[in-house]
């Protein structure tokens, strides 16, 4: 569950569940910073614009990131 705030981390809970790349509207990867000491991955779904915090350590999520970056490299000229 993401939570808006001015400082510190955004994700309150994280999901190990894989997400279908086709159902993704947006995938945000927020690197660790002075405000939050961990990488955060926030998926925005096409359906209802629902958001989900993903577990960067999950194998399924790592595979998702690979699939998305592969798709992006196909699209780029």
């Amino acid at each position: 569950v993401p939570l808006s705030r001015t400082v510190r981390c955004t994700c309150i809970s994280i999901s190990n569940q894989p997400v279908n790349p086709r159902s993704l509207e947006k995938l945000e990867i927020i690197p660790a910073s002075q405000f939050c000491p961990r990488v955060e991955i926030i998926a925005t779904m096409k359906k209802k614009g629902e958001k989900r915090c993903l577990n960067p350590e999950s194998k399924a999520i790592k595979n998702l990131l690979k699939a998305v970056s592969k798709e992006m490299s196909k699209r780029s000229p």
Epitope: L3, I12, S13, S15, N16, R52
Partner: antibody
């Protein structure tokens, strides 16, 4: 099965301290934010505190800020609430609840049975 | 801080009737952040509806949620004996506190 079990409640004098525990089982505790919610006798629900899945984020209701501390031990699958400077108005049933992670906000989907705290001289 | 108001305070109905419960917020709440809970005497609350309109796992389809902005509604299409309880709405806005409404008691007429 998915379960939360609170303990540590009891009768305590005003100004004293108490620590509540919540033992989690049946799910990946270390992935879930956790809440404490209380209910005074005959009253409604009051959100008390929230801690993020890895303990980095902590949030409190104004009524307990500076007196209560939420914490967790993911290696023990346990949530805590340290309550200091207790007042008569803190008398309530205290529930721990899971913040469901599979969506933007799916509410508090698992609750414990509650533990009763009575603050009285 | 967002304040939630629920009406009516008590709703007296008979089994089989339709119940309409209202939850009003003092400022706009994203639909993603509005939940409804049921609580029976001596029991912990149970999540019914999340995201204003999505039923939680195992919740019968006679329960439905709707609304957006500041006005939200929980509807029980046909009251069953086990539905007589107190119902709370809760907002999980962009920052704490994550307030609950004062509750609506649905009792038997």
């Amino acid at each position: 099965q998915v379960q939360l079990v609170e303990s540590g409640g009891g009768v305590v004098q005003p100004g004293r301290s108490l620590r509540l525990s919540c033992a989690a089982s049946g799910f990946t505790f270390s992935n879930c934010g956790m809440h404490w919610v209380r209910q005074a006798p005959g009253k409604g629900l009051e959100w008390v505190a929230l801690i993020g899945y890895d303990g980095i984020n902590e949030y409190y209701a104004d009524s307990v800020k500076g007196r209560f501390t939420i914490s967790r031990d993911n290696s023990k699958n346990t949530l805590y609430l340290q309550m200091n400077s207790l007042r008569a108005e803190d008398t309530a049933v205290f529930y721990c609840a899971r913040d469901w992670p599979e969506g933007y906000y799916n509410g508090m989907d698992v609750w414990g049975q509650g533990t009763t705290v009575t603050v009285s001289s | 801080e967002i304040v939630l108001t629920q009406s009516p305070g008590t709703l007296s109905l008979s089994p089989g009737e339709r119940a309409t419960l209202s939850c009003r917020a003092s400022q706009s709440v994203s639909s993603s952040y509005l939940a409804w809970y049921q609580q029976k005497p001596g029991q912990a609350p149970r999540l019914l509806i999340y995201g204003a309109s999505s039923r939680a796992t195992g919740i019968p389809d006679r329960f439905s949620g709707s609304g957006s902005g500041t006005d939200f509604t929980l509807t029980i299409s046909r009251l069953e004996p086990e539905d007589f309880a107190v119902y709370y709405c809760q907002q999980y806005g962009s920052s704490p506190p994550f307030t609950f409404g004062p509750g609506t008691k649905v009792d038997i007429k």
